[in-house]
Amino acid sequence: LRPSRVHNSEENTMRALTLKDILNGTFSYKTFFPNWISGQEYLHQSADNNIVLYNIETGQSYTILSNRTMKSVNASNYGLSPDRQFVYLESDYSKLWRYSYTATYYIYDLSNGEFVRGNELPRPIQYLCWSPVGSKLAYVYQNNIYLKQRPGDPPFQITFNGRENKIFNGIPDWVYEEEMLATKYALWWSPNGKFLAYAEFNDTDIPVIAYSYYGDEQYPRTINIPYPKAGAKNPVVRIFIIDTTYPAYVGPQEVPVPAMIASSDYYFSWLTWVTDERVCLQWLKRVQNVSVLSICDFREDWQTWDCPKTQEHIEESRTGWAGGFFVSTPVFSYDAISYYKIFSDKDGYKHIHYIKDTVENAIQITSGKWEAINIFRVTQDSLFYSSNEFEEYPGRRNIYRISIGSYPPSKKCVTCHLRKERCQYYTASFSDYAKYYALVCYGPGIPISTLHDGRTDQEIKILEENKELENALKNIQLPKEEIKKLEVDEITLWYKMILPPQFDRSKKYPLLIQVYGGPCSQSVRSVFAVNWISYLASKEGMVIALVDGRGTAFQGDKLLYAVYRKLGVYEVEDQITAVRKFIEMGFIDEKRIAIWGWSYGGYVSSLALASGTGLFKCGIAVAPVSSWEYYASVYTERFMGLPTKDDNLEHYKNSTVMARAEYFRNVDYLLIHGTADDNVHFQNSAQIAKALVNAQVDFQAMWYSDQNHGLSGLSTNHLYTHMTHFLKQCFSLSD
């Protein structure tokens, strides 16, 4: 719960937030996600680093792995085998890209309290996981996949063609990791561990991005990453399945690609096991408005996988791209052929549909002018999902249960009235068979995690309520937050406004717009945060606003697909429109308005500054995209098509920041980028800087040597300190 406001005499004891508070993470919160190991048991790492097993039904707990064992190998993570015999301990974590990292793995035998000796795992390993049943191990080492029947056994090598930056087996290449799978792995065990499916990515023909990593040596290193930019050659993907019981018998079998997909460039988008002998693959055309879901069956006689055309389901968008950010994945029901899936209904809202035979005959399960966001779990009698239906606030998330065992199916909101003021944005984590579940509430009040009975929805206990945070905030003057909407030309613009603690409508305040604005994003959410903008409002007396304009998510396809093939136009227009509306509210000093954003937000903030409206005095772009020709194919082409003459080259060319260099003359611009940004390459800011210099336009810039897209560590402190000075100078605020 947010601390209640204190008035008059007591107000003197309260202090504003400081930048130091933010940089030290003084007011960060904790969440509790149980590591479920059965219907009624979960593991959790205690404050003193013991791994503890909790049994919900007995209310009892005991340590299964001591902190001493963890410390003996400097373990930072662990994983219990499903047969409960072994634990892998992960150490020497070394980050690669957003999800990927390498690590050293040790196997600990819980039965005898000793590490498994003999046939130890090689190091460093790129990915490792237990089979879903028993204690088989699959792992990826040097881009090849290996299998162990038991942890102490010698490994069986499944693939042999793995090669750094060329062939990736069981792990994605850069673009699949970042823009398609959003995981560090590309292998999937069948439910009982009989089969192992994996992807092979061939990056041989992909152009390479190369940048300097300065380090401490006399000569900088060059980092080379196969990275397909818009219109470039893409990875070639193949899916294989191997029988892990007799891996040498027939070897890996390739799963056929649907003919309508294979006829031109395509992507693999996800794999879902249905049973041990049925698998579901999703494919996507390079022009990402056609997706095919293909259900394949194992043929015992031929030892191959058969994907009949009758089990191909096509999803097509006529108004934009397929899906939201990604194409949704199916959740299969107990009959192992029908499934539940979220896609657009006839009114252009993303909803849950039940598909039994064909997509055309799909039964719509949810409907309304709101969107279903995620299907968490389907049991014999219930379907649990999240949506933003409640009270028509798109930036909320509540958990619902639909009874599918009865007709007509009844719907119940599990979370809507639990802690109504404190909690309006939830996610959930379910145990086996949804016997129990944890709810994690992210706000708008102080986050809280609770445990619930899966049959009655009754709260069993509080897992984490952030009491220390609540106490720490008692003497802090937090800003006020409002979430409201503007109606402009048949478009609804939701905004969040962060106001100084002693906000007075009759006074004038400087305004900072914080923007992201990327396709299928959402910035206006009912979540708790004490961050940099909280400080700017609390201590520096600024008003901060976040606006979800066209292109943003969870409000229907009309808003979402408005930016299709036209990035950089409506997102910017809607920020400008909102600023004009804020000025009309009467408390904004129109001579002191700024805009800032990071990544896509850096692109939008740059275009807004260069819009020639005269609205903005200054602005900041952190790691901005400056031309869509410089960004990744999978992401960019989803929204922009191809940069070819017969497709959308014209808009690629006229949506660049560089084309507007001249318009920066009348604003103060701060451009910031990390030199080792693997995602939005430094090239983007280098080209903006070059264009500004060529146009003889003055600007400020800061680079962060050897830092990636996240600008982490000490760079974070430097970054926010630097941006604070810039804004205070822009707004004529004393330091």
């Epitope: 059965s38 219907g39 009624q40 048991e41 013991n50 097993l53 049994n55 039904e57 007995t58 009892q60 005991y62 340590t63 299964i64 792995l65 001591s66 064992t69 219990l80 409960r84 015999q85 819980l110 039965s111 309290g113 016997k435």
Partner: nanobody, 116 residues
Framework: QVQLQESGGGLVQAGGSLRLSCAAS????????MGWYRQAPGKQRELVAG???????KYVESVKGRFTISRDNAKNTVHLQMNSLKVEDTAVYYC??????????WGQGTQVTVSS
């Protein structure tokens, strides 16, 4: 602290059967997951089978189809029915929580000897 008492071991010929029992007493109730473990001479202790509080069972590959784990919550006991016994099943058999706690307190165990 929980006390665990194993019984039912003995000498049996290959192909024969035995039924082991484990009685649990003390502060931790029988609803916790329980497992049977064994230690052969000169070897390390290993898991044989486990049973969760909801009755879900798990077996190591070498005993699948021959051994059956069951539980009687009313009597706080866990059983291991061992059929088609092999010489390599010879070991001291122990019961404990599944997985065992740290530090693990093991009972005396019960000796199973399978002769050829």
């Amino acid at each position: 602290q929980v006390q665990l008492q194993e019984s039912g071991g003995g000498l049996v010929q290959a192909g024969g059967s035995l039924r082991l029992s484990c009685a649990a007493s003390g502060t931790m109730s029988s609803i916790n997951a329980m497992g049977w473990y064994r230690q052969a001479p000169g070897k390390q202790r290993e898991l044989v089978a486990g049973i969760l509080s909801d009755g879900t069972t798990k077996y190591v590959e070498s005993v699948k189809g021959r051994f059956t784990i069951s539980r009687d919550n009313a009597k706080n006991t866990v059983h291991l029915q061992m059929n088609s016994l092999k010489v390599e099943d010879t070991a001291v058999y122990y019961c404990n929580f599944f997985p065992p706690p740290v530090p693990a307190s093991w009972g005396q165990g019960t000796q199973v000897t399978v002769s050829s």
